[in-house]
């Protein structure tokens, strides 16, 4: 049309002396906020801070006490088949997805979804509900470990013998059990071990049931307070403090685990324990429960669907190659789980040999392993006090960094909702103190005499595999089918300089959702109401409370969809289209000018949006 004129203009341009354009407006740095906005988002001071924080966050108690037991229970080496299917099909893809969307959007666990797909920002809320509940009960384990640690500083471990005030006439020391024939004769009488009695009668002072909460255990309440204080001071300065604390908390447990591994492997009976741990039984793979265990273990052990990994990723520099590090961290995490099995089962093998019983009789999972089986094992070793102190310090450090990384994730997610309010002055620190205090007060219900029942209720329902699978499904669905896997790959390429192989993209689109739906359905089909110690049956009201805890997170997704659609006006399809479109995409923006006020609402492409706090915070 006007090619001639256009070419003439270009010729004139080339003839002229070419000068740089001066420009006038004050720019804003990539990470800076415009004047009057919240302070700029801090970043990890070095790559190692991030790597160690993630390592500390997901290498936790589950690696040591859950994976080895699941391996033994579900067919030994054969369990590695479903484990690796879930690892590569959902664990690593979701783990990387959470890190990368945090890094990409520079937002925490809620607001990142607000940016990616406002209609599904309930994913973020669901994650925060799960992590908030998790933070209340996970730390109770650390309170128990602290109590055991203090009790270990004695010449004689208090769970080694039966001569204590808390012991019953039925208490029988393990030296008696070495004689198998004597043990068989007397085992018809209900004899208990001093370790079990210490755990149930001293530590827990276990009441008859959840409807008998009893009194507060002040010693445990103080231990809980202590670990909450440590947790608070580890995160109160944000990633500046978290990033430095993990240098110790994330590395020291590995050294201790190595020491325990060497100790275990040099004990008599270790070989039998390891054989028991890994001997493959392929027939077990026919049981859906094995697959459910593999799936849920992956989700637990990678600390995904909690918003924590997204929050950690959000402090990365935009150009940081997190793909490479996520893969290495995955190897570290699963490797730690695998190696822990050797450390645990070598000691269980020794213990079984010492007692003259089958390994199946001593193999435990969860608190049973940490507070019954292992403490019992150390009483049979030379230098029991030393090994006990070492074990409980390792347990504490393993759990502590997982705890404070998850609290950091929770805090980041919430602070990012109200940045202009919560990032000013000391408000963030005050807010952290508030969250920690509330969580501590809720945790006190778990350090009463009936506290163990409350703890198990939270453990079984609040952060159950079902909740995590639900969140993971929606995360992958939104990224693959609404935001678009290719679009995210464009962003990843912009950040790390290349596109990862298609494996991730296909996992988000098909493999992970299929695995999640399958696992979710089987979990519901195979659901059995919670019991304690396979004997105590929870009352219906407690089961109802448990399901309320589970649904409190899961319902966030549909609930937010309904709320968002109600907040937006206009034709239904226009509303849906608008809410499926990414928001606030440019974190380098200096201003937001295009929103036109209309009837005290905002007009956006035919959709009227009522100004709620979320829309105001993330869009204006």
């Amino acid at each position: 049309m006007a090619t001639k004129e256009k070419l003439q203009c270009l010729k004139d341009f080339h003839k002229d002396i070419l000068k740089p354009s001066p420009g006038k407006s004050p720019g804003t740095r990539p990470e800076d906020e415009a004047e009057g906005k919240p302070p700029q988002r801090e970043k990890w001071s070095s790559k190692i801070d991030f790597v160690l924080s993630v390592a500390g966050g997901f290498v936790g108690l589950g690696n040591v006490w859950r994976f080895p037991y699941l391996c033994y229970k579900n067919g030994g080496g054969a369990f590695l088949i479903p484990y690796f299917i879930f690892l590569f099909g959902s664990g690593l893809p979701v783990f990387f997805l959470e890190i990368i969307i945090g890094q990409y959007t520079s937002e925490g666990g809620i607001t990142c979804w607000e940016k990616i797909c406002p209609l599904f920002s309930g994913i973020g809320y669901a994650s925060v509900v799960i992590v908030s509940l998790l933070n209340v009960y996970y730390i109770v384990i650390l309170a128990w470990a602290t109590y055991y640690l203090f009790q270990s500083f004695q010449k004689e471990l208090p769970w080694a013998h039966c001569n204590h005030s808390w012991n019953t006439p039925h208490c029988m020391e393990d030296t008696m059990r070495k004689n198998k024939s004597v043990w068989i004769t007397i085992s018809s009488t209900n004899f208990t071990s001093p370790v079990i009695e210490f755990w149930e009668r001293n530590v827990l002072s276990l009441s008859p049931g959840i409807d008998h909460p009893g009194s507060l255990k002040w010693d445990l309440a103080l231990c809980l307070l202590l670990v909450w204080l440590v947790c608070f001071f580890c995160i109160w300065k944000g990633v500046r403090s978290t990033g430095k604390v993990v240098y110790f908390t994330a590395t020291f447990p590995f050294a201790m685990l190595l020491v325990l591994l060497v100790r275990g492997l040099t004990l008599p009976g270790a070989g039998a324990g390891i054989k028991f741990y890994l001997y493959p039984d392929i027939t077990r793979l026919e049981d859906p429960q094995v697959w459910i265990d593999a799936g849920t273990q992956i989700f637990f052990s990678y600390a995904i669907c909690l918003g924590a990994m997204t929050s950690l990723g959000s402090y990365n520099k935009y150009k940081y190659n997190s793909y490479r590090d996520c893969m290495l961290l995955g190897c570290l995490n699963s490797g730690t789980s695998f190696v822990s099995g050797f450390a645990i089962f070598s000691i269980l093998g020794f213990m079984a040999q010492e007692q003259g019983v089958d390994i199946a009789d001593v193999a435990e999972s969860g608190p049973g392993l940490a507070f019954i089986a292992y403490p019992k094992a150390v009483t049979m070793m030379p230098l029991p006090t030393f090994w006990s102190i070492l074990f409980f310090i390792m347990l504490l450090l393993l759990g502590l960094d997982s705890q404070f990384v998850e609290v950091e994730g929770q805090i980041t997610s919430l602070v990012d909702l109200y940045p202009s309010f919560l990032r000013k002055g000391y408000r963030r620190e005050i807010f952290i103190a508030f969250v920690c205090s509330i969580s501590y007060l809720l945790g006190l219900t778990m350090v009463t005499e009936g506290g163990m029942y409350v703890f198990q209720l939270f453990d079984y329902y609040a952060a159950s595999g079902v909740c995590l699978l639900w969140v993971a499904f929606f995360e992958c669905f939104v990224i693959a089918w609404i935001y678009g896997g290719d679009n995210l790959y464009d962003g990843i390429e912009d950040m790390i300089g290349y596109r990862p192989g298609p494996w991730m993209k296909y996992s988000w689109a098909v493999i992970t959702p299929v695995l999640c739906v399958g696992c979710f359905i089987f979990s519901l089909v195979k659901y059995v109401p919670l019991t304690y110690n396979k004997t105590y049956v929870y009352p219906n009201w407690a089961i109802g409370l448990g399901w309320s805890l589970a649904l409190s997170s899961m319902l966030c997704v549909p609930l937010v969809i309904v709320i968002r659609l109600c907040q937006t006006e206009g034709p239904f399809l226009v509303r849906v289209k608008y809410l499926l479109t990414p928001r606030e995409p440019n974190r380098w923006a200096v201003e937001r000018e295009g929103a036109t006020p209309y009837n005290s609402r905002t007009v956006m492409n035919g959709a009227l949006v009522k100004p709620t706090h979320i829309i105001v915070e993330t869009m204006m």
């Epitope: 740089p20 354009s21 420009g23 407006s25 720019g27 804003t28 740095r29 990539p30 990409y104 959007t105 520079s106 940016k115 990616i116 935009y318 150009k319 935001y483 679009n487 464009d490 962003g491 912009d494 950040m495 300089g497 289209k577 608008y578 479109t581 990414p582 928001r583 606030e584 995409p585 440019n586 974190r587 380098w588 923006a589 200096v590 201003e591 937001r592 000018e593 295009g594 929103a595 036109t596 956006m604 492409n605 869009m619």
Partner: antibody, heavy 122, light 107 residues
Framework: QVQLQQPGAEFVKPGTSVKLSCKAS?????RYWINWVKLRPGQGLEW???????????NYNEKFKSKATLTVDTFSSTAYMQLSSLASEDSGLYYC???????????????WGQGTLVTVSA | DIQMTQTTSSLSASLGDRVTINCRAS??????LNWYQQKPDGTVKLLIY???RLHSRVPSRFSGSGSGTDYSLTISNLEQEDIATYFC?????????FGGGTKLEIK
């Protein structure tokens, strides 16, 4: 494939205004920032501003704040830039350009329109 | 604003030559430097982004380097189709700013 179509030329009188269009195709229009860039002989390229069609989020270069107004029509997948109170120094070639990625940075432009030549003359 | 300076406004080279075009920023731009090619017919093409990353379908004879405030675009083996004007642009701080351009001609 991604295409940004601009009219070839606009002839306008000083003191009036002109509305330049940029019709997008081959992608989801609402999800990507549209940038406007001016080429003027002797001045090189100058970034005017950008707009995010989904929310009408806008960034302006302070220099062009009172000169340019960016808008979009999501239904026709068209971005517009209105230039007001035109003077001879507003003559030049105006390009629209699209960013590569949807979220985060919008600092480089792989997709460009052909440009509209604006001539301000009495 | 960050000022971008391309000291050479025009450059003559022979086909097959190795050509380097320089660009200087008024402050550190953390490698957020992009290069564009504007053909005589007005079409603009992205060549390199983030200092050294080659945009898709850009011939490998184009390469970018630099850090801090000094950056350069190199054409290793000049071809006829490379006759154009080359602009640098910083993507570190709003508003994005461009260099004045370097016009490349055949000797």
């Amino acid at each position: 494939q991604v295409q940004l179509q601009q009219p070839g030329a606009e002839f306008v009188k000083p003191g009036t205004s002109v509305k330049l269009s940029c019709k997008a195709s081959g992608y989801n229009f609402t999800r990507y920032w549209i940038n406007w860039v001016k080429l003027r002989p002797g001045q090189g390229l100058e970034w005017i501003g950008n707009i995010y069609p989904a929310t009408n989020g806008i960034n302006y270069n302070e220099k062009f704040k009172s000169k340019a107004t960016l808008t979009v029509d999501t239904f026709s997948s068209t971005a517009y830039m209105q230039l007001s109170s035109l003077a001879s120094e507003d003559s030049g070639l105006y390009y629209c350009a699209r960013c590569k990625t949807m979220l985060s940075r919008c600092a480089w432009f792989p997709y460009w329109g052909q440009g509209t030549l604006v001539t301000v003359s009495a | 604003d960050i000022q971008m300076t391309q000291t050479t406004s025009s450059l003559s080279a022979s086909l097959g030559d190795r050509v380097t075009i320089n660009c200087r920023a008024s402050q550190d731009i953390s490698n957020y430097l992009n290069w564009y090619q504007q053909k005589p017919d007005g079409t603009v093409k992205l060549l390199i982004y983030d200092t050294s990353r080659l945009h898709s379908r850009v011939p490998s004879r184009f390469s970018g380097s630099g850090s801090g405030t000094d950056y350069s675009l190199t054409i290793s083996n000049l071809e006829q189709e490379d006759i154009a004007t080359y602009f640098c642009q910083q993507g570190n701080m709003l508003p994005w700013t461009f260099g004045g351009g370097t016009k490349l001609e055949i000797k």
